[in-house]
């Protein structure tokens, strides 16, 4: 019948009822043989004696030399098949064999699942020699027991390189429940159903799973483990766990936020870091992304100018880098600037506005009324020309640029030359005679150099040729240049 | 061997409070549940409802949503019953008795001596 | 709530003889898993109650084999083969299938 021997009074046996070769304990020692603690090697020799071949599980002994009399059969005695005993606890079992001592080198192994148990186990090997046989106590002890130590044990004789296997003896250790699945976080849609689980094992088996809520309980009677735990929707916040049980007591799984995916919170800290004349550079802190990755965002631009017709400019941009850079502005210009990022939910308002201006632009038209002429007596070259009409936003005119490229045979060198704001004329040093010296002008301001007027061509003769008419370029503009010579 | 002690018998008067105690030893504390069971002189059992000893988390019977609390010491293994507001009809025997659900359903396996509350004025 | 109801209310018995307690429940204890969570408990004079049978006919530890428990769906027994002196007390039944766990109102085993 089974034996129990608990720690303490258990609301239901695991069998109902008696099962042979069982153990149910939580201080096992099957044996009251004298033992050395310690770390023992597992393998221990039997004095020397003849040997004898044997088949299966049992070595059957041949004839003797002297033919008088059959040997019995080898076996390991029977012995407790099934130990249950709590985690923590301590265990001793034992294989037990007795050998004629006409056997020499036996050894005695332990084997767990198949593989054998080497090194620092807790194997105790103890010979009782009498006139014929040796009693072979083989004991193994394993404090503090684990549910990595549950399994089925055997012990392995080898006589003369023949093996006789033990009954196995198998070993349930029983603990409290052990979560293999616990509910995870979550970002859900509110009012939308989803599922979380549970699951627990033993031994002892069966585990039952509870859900809470906020610290309410889901279900006052429980479910089976695996529990699948179907939440219809929620439209706030909630921690969930479980709890596991079974006869050894109960668990309690970690608790998980199950969040309400929302709209974004604005984002924040938009920063300016470069304006030019028609682009500004801005970044932005996101915002709470509202438990749904941004999507991405929307830069809005709006011009601040009593005469603007106040619309808005809207630039799509992806949620990552928390940058972007707005073109197609106007020089000179002042703009108020938000920043809103979207999830799968919605948009987010929009951040606090800011306040950026672009710089003065470079002018937009070149000057007008280019005329060059040849001064021969002075060797120089005039060239006038007329203010160009330039836009407020490409900001104050401080000065131009003179193109002049100088082309002969094999050779054509251009100079720039740089003149103030109040100038509308300028005279260059002929570079070289015998070419032809083409001239173009640009207006430059703060926010750089305009485009360049057309080029008028003027052609200098070698010395002692007298030529004194322009070239010009027609006021209106942009005409084909004209060279009078 | 485990064992549930509670604290002694109160004298109170209506419109009070009480706070019962169920100090557990030989187990471990916080791997249980603990069930409260009242007894009205001369009558039968009612199932208060429990509290998981790890994680607080109580569930009270209907009756005894209110002025019932379920707490713990998990330092000390005790488990507490605070009642307020006390009327007379809560003089009775209040037991703890260590509760979790096995592979035979809930389990009330071990029981506190009782603790006797009397509401008097 | 699952109403628990016992008879008889009083039970005098001569030591030695047999005794049988009923307890009907109005709903079935049977669970969805094929379980009946019916219960009996033992409360001696004086003393704290004690478990005695659970999912109606197992002993619990330490009860002696003259206890014995049947029944299914809402009609359940608890029988003592032969009456002994320890045995005086109040017997309940209690159910565990449905929330919240209810129980019978007491037969009390007195000897006569």
């Known amino acids: 019948a089974i034996t129990e021997a608990r720690e303490e009074a258990k609301p239901y046996p695991l069998f109902p009822g008696p099962l042979p070769g069982s153990l149910q304990t939580d201080h096992t020692s099957l044996l009251s043989l004298p033992h050395t603690s310690g770390y023992q090697p597992a393998l221990m020799f039997s004095p020397t004696q003849p040997g004898r071949p044997y088949t299966g599980n049992v070595a059957i002994p041949r004839v003797t030399s002297a033919g008088s009399k059959l040997l019995p059969p080898l076996a390991f005695k029977h012995t407790v098949g099934h130990i249950i005993l709590s985690e923590h606890k301590d265990v001793k079992f034992n294989c037990s064999i007795s050998v004629p001592n006409i056997y020499q080198d036996t050894t005695i192994s332990w084997w767990k699942d198949g593989k054998e148990l080497l090194g620092a186990h807790h194997a105790i090997t103890q010979f009782y020699p009498d006139d014929e046989v040796t009693a072979i106590i083989a004991s193994f002890s394993i404090t503090s027991v684990q549910r990595s130590d549950n399994g089925s044990y055997i012990c392995k004789m080898k006589i003369n390189n023949e093996e006789i296997v033990s009954d196995p003896i198998y070993i349930e250790v029983q603990g409290l429940p052990h979560f293999t699945k616990q509910p995870e976080s979550m970002n859900v849609t509110r009012n939308t159903a989803f599922n979380l689980t549970c699951q627990a094992v033993g031994p002892p088996e069966p585990v039952n799973i509870f859900w809470v809520q906020n610290s309410s309980r889901v279900n006052e009677q429980p479910e089976k483990s695996p529990s699948v735990l179907t939440v219809p929707g929620l439209t706030e916040m909630a921690v969930f766990s479980c709890e596991a049980h079974n006869d050894k007591g109960l668990t309690v799984s970690k608790g998980v936020q199950i969040n309400i995916k929302a709209i974004p919170s604005p984002p924040t800290e938009v920063s300016i870091h470069n304006s030019t004349a028609h682009s500004i550079l801005i970044s932005w802190v996101p915002g709470f992304d509202g438990y749904s990755p941004f999507r991405n965002c929307s830069v809005q631009v709006k011009e601040v100018d009593p005469l603007s017709n106040g619309s808005v400019m809207i630039f799509n941009t992806s949620a990552s880098p928390h940058m972007y850079q707005i073109k197609q502005l106007q020089a000179l210009a002042n703009y108020s600037i938000g920043v809103s990022c979207m999830n799968e939910i919605g948009w987010s308002a929009v951040s606090p506005w800011i306040l950026a201006s672009t710089t003065e632009g470079a002018p937009s038209v070149a000057p007008l009324n280019v005329t060059v002429f040849l001064n021969e007596s002075r060797d120089n070259v005039d060239i006038r020309w007329m203010k160009p009409l330039t836009k407020r936003q490409a900001g104050e005119l401080v000065g131009y640029r003179i193109s002049h490229v100088w082309q002969s045979a094999g050779i054509s060198k251009e100079l720039l030359e740089e003149v103030g704001q109040n100038n509308s004329r300028a005279q260059i040093s002929v570079q070289v005679h015998n070419a032809t010296c083409t001239v173009r002008i640009a207006a430059v301001t703060k926010g750089g150099v305009g485009p360049f007027s057309d080029p008028v061509k003027i052609f200098i003769p070698a010395h002692g040729w007298v030529d004194h008419a322009p070239s010009s370029t027609p006021a209106p503009g942009n005409a084909d240049p004209v060279l009078i010579i | 061997q485990v064992q549930l002690v509670q604290s002694g018998s109160e004298l109170k008067k209506p419109g009070a409070s009480v706070k019962v105690s169920c100090k557990a030893s030989?187990?471990?504390?916080?791997?249980?549940?603990m069930s409260w069971v009242r007894q009205a002189p001369g009558q039968g059992l009612e199932w208060m409802g429990w509290i998981n000893n790890y994680s607080g988390v109580s569930t009270y019977a209907d009756d005894f949503k209110g002025r019932f609390v379920f707490s713990l010491d998990t330092s000390v293994s005790t488990a507490y019953l605070q009642i307020s507001s006390l009327k007379a009809e809560d003089t009775a025997v209040y037991y703890c008795?260590?509760?979790?659900?096995?592979?035979?359903?809930?389990?009330?396996?071990?029981w506190g001596q009782g603790t006797t509350v009397t509401v008097s004025s | 709530d699952v109403v628990m109801t016992q008879s008889p209310l009083s039970l005098p018995v001569t030591l030695g003889q047999p005794a049988s307690i009923s307890c009907k429940s109005s709903?079935?204890?049977?669970?969805?898993?094929?379980?009946?969570?019916l219960n009996w408990l033992q409360q001696r004079p004086g003393q704290s109650p004690r478990r005695l049978m659970y999912l109606v006919s197992k002993l619990d530890s330490g009860v002696p084999d003259r206890f014995s428990g049947s029944g299914s769906g809402t009609d359940f027994t608890l029988k003592i083969s032969r009456v002994e002196a320890e045995d005086v007390g109040v017997y309940y039944c209690?159910?565990?299938?449905?929330?919240?766990?209810?129980f019978g109102g007491g037969t009390k085993v007195e000897i006569k």
């Open positions: 209690w159910q565990g299938t449905h929330f919240p766990r209810t």
């Open positions: 030989g187990n471990t504390f916080t791997t249980y549940g």
């Open positions: 709903q079935s204890l049977l669970d969805s898993e094929g379980k009946t969570y």
């Open positions: 008795a260590r509760d979790y659900y096995g592979s035979g359903g809930w389990v009330f396996d071990y």
